[in-house]
């Protein structure tokens, strides 16, 4: 039993880091493998993560963490029984993938304006809370070419757009994702999408 692709890990910078790797053949990850992780810190203990299958030869492990700070470094040991398959380390602050925003809502009752709001996925005491920026994706269910991205570079988790920038009388969907420049993070996953019917009063044309 050998590791084909070494574990790569990302942290949500809150409570979970996710490590993925591939074995050289079909593996029952949860029964055959264990990933031990330990914070490099005085009097810390090793903790065990039981991996799950992620495709035939792929494994994924969700490492629980109390919290994350920039100096944290973890040692990682991948075991198959008594055999050490791989040894490495992981610094969460250097491999951050933020949590996806939630509760995306489209408010259509503001006159001719669409107000999209969502929730910051971090509590106020987390460092990323005040460092997230967002991308909002809006697309038409009827027209694949009607697909747009709005970059939200301010901290408030909301976006206002004129309803008239979208076509009237058809359904749209929106989703949002986040990233943090301060840690050069990857983008989060997209939030669940939300749907609404776009309708607004056409302005009277004067001839």
């Amino acid at each position: 039993m050998k590791v084909l692709q070494e574990p790569t890990c990302v942290s949500d910078y809150m409570s979970i880091s996710t490590c993925e790797w591939k074995m050289n053949g079909p593996t029952n990850c949860s029964t055959e493998l264990r990933l031990l992780y330990q914070l490099v810190f005085l009097l810390s203990e090793a903790h065990t993560c039981i991996p799950e299958n992620n495709g035939g030869a792929g494994c994924v492990c969700h490492l629980l963490m109390d919290d994350v700070v920039s100096a944290d470094n973890y040692t990682l040991d991948l075991w198959a029984g008594q055999q050490l398959l791989w040894k490495g380390s992981f610094k969460p602050s250097e491999h951050v993938k933020p949590r996806a925003p939630g509760n995306l809502t489209v408010h259509t009752n503001v006159s001719d304006t669409l107000l999209l709001t969502w929730s910051n996925p971090y509590p106020p005491d987390n460092y990323l809370y005040n460092h997230l920026t967002y991308a909002v994706n809006i697309w038409s269910e009827n027209d694949p070419a009607d697909f747009r991205i709005y970059n939200v570079t301010y901290l408030e988790p909301s976006l206002r757009i004129a309803a008239s920038t979208l076509k009237s009388g058809i359904s749209y969907r929106a989703r949002v994702r986040a990233w943090a420049q301060c840690y050069n993070t990857t983008w989060s996953e997209w939030s669940p999408s939300t749907k609404w019917h776009n309708s607004y009063r056409e302005p009277f044309e004067q001839h």
Partner: antibody, heavy 125, light 112 residues
């Protein structure tokens, strides 16, 4: 009520051995790291050794490395310090102390918040 | 190893007056979780050490509020706002960030 009671000290010749014990009550012993600290006559405090709650992490001062062994029995709520090849400079009062919570991913530190009464080790011919 | 340096080494005090002890570390004791891994202990004559302050500024349970700890990084101070007769003994600072734990030389506080 938290209590730590050391025993096992005494007079021993250079090169001899002693085993100190620290019996603990009043807290969830297996969740906490434990430490040994000593104090030579008329001197300051010197840390000797520490062990994590599960026993997997062990640390020693350079002055005792290779001669002293720390261990614990969580079923007996007791931490031990096996001292071999004793030297005159090991003469001291030995204290055990309750250390940080070590079962969390990041150990939670609240100081060495409880100490035993100490046991005296004298190394002399 | 981290070297801890206390001053003064001896401090005669007058009951009711304030007192202050300094502790300097050769290494930054502020970890990125925001905590300074620096403690203060009092060893009264003939007794075991007892914890006064942990993580730089947190008073241990049962410690009178006349004791306070301050400082960050490498420079720390223990203050007693109004010394009482029962406060005599040797005060030790200790760093708990790295192995080996290291103590200051101790400051002997006694009544003038």
């Amino acid at each position: 009520e938290v209590q730590l009671v050391e025993s096992g000290g005494g007079l021993v010749q250079p090169g001899g051995s002693l085993r100190l014990s620290c019996a603990v009550s009043g807290f969830t012993f297996s969740s906490y790291a434990m430490s040994w600290v000593r104090q030579a006559p008329g001197k300051g405090l010197e840390w000797v050794s520490s062990i994590t709650g599960g026993g997997g992490g062990i640390y020693y001062a350079d002055s005792v490395k290779g001669r002293f062994t720390i261990s614990r029995d969580n079923s007996k709520n007791t931490v031990y310090l096996q001292m071999n090849s004793l030297r005159a400079e090991d003469t001291a009062v030995y204290y055990c102390a309750k250390d940080r919570i070590s079962i969390t991913i990041r150990p939670r530190y609240f100081g060495l918040d409880f100490w035993g009464q100490g046991t005296t080790v004298t190394v002399s011919s | 190893d981290i070297v801890m340096t206390q001053s003064p080494l001896s401090l005669p005090v007058t009951p009711g007056e304030p007192a202050s002890i300094s502790c300097r570390s050769s290494h930054n004791l502020l970890y990125s979780n925001g905590y300074n891994y620096l403690d203060w202990y009092l060893q009264k004559p003939g007794q075991s050490p007892q914890l006064l302050i942990y993580l730089g500024s947190n008073r241990a349970y049962g410690v009178p509020d006349r004791f306070s700890g301050s400082g960050s990084g490498t420079d720390f101070t223990l203050k007693i706002s109004r010394v009482e007769a029962e406060d005599v003994g040797v005060y030790h600072c200790m760093q708990a960030l790295q192995s080996p734990y290291t103590f200051g030389q101790g400051t002997k506080v006694d009544i003038k």
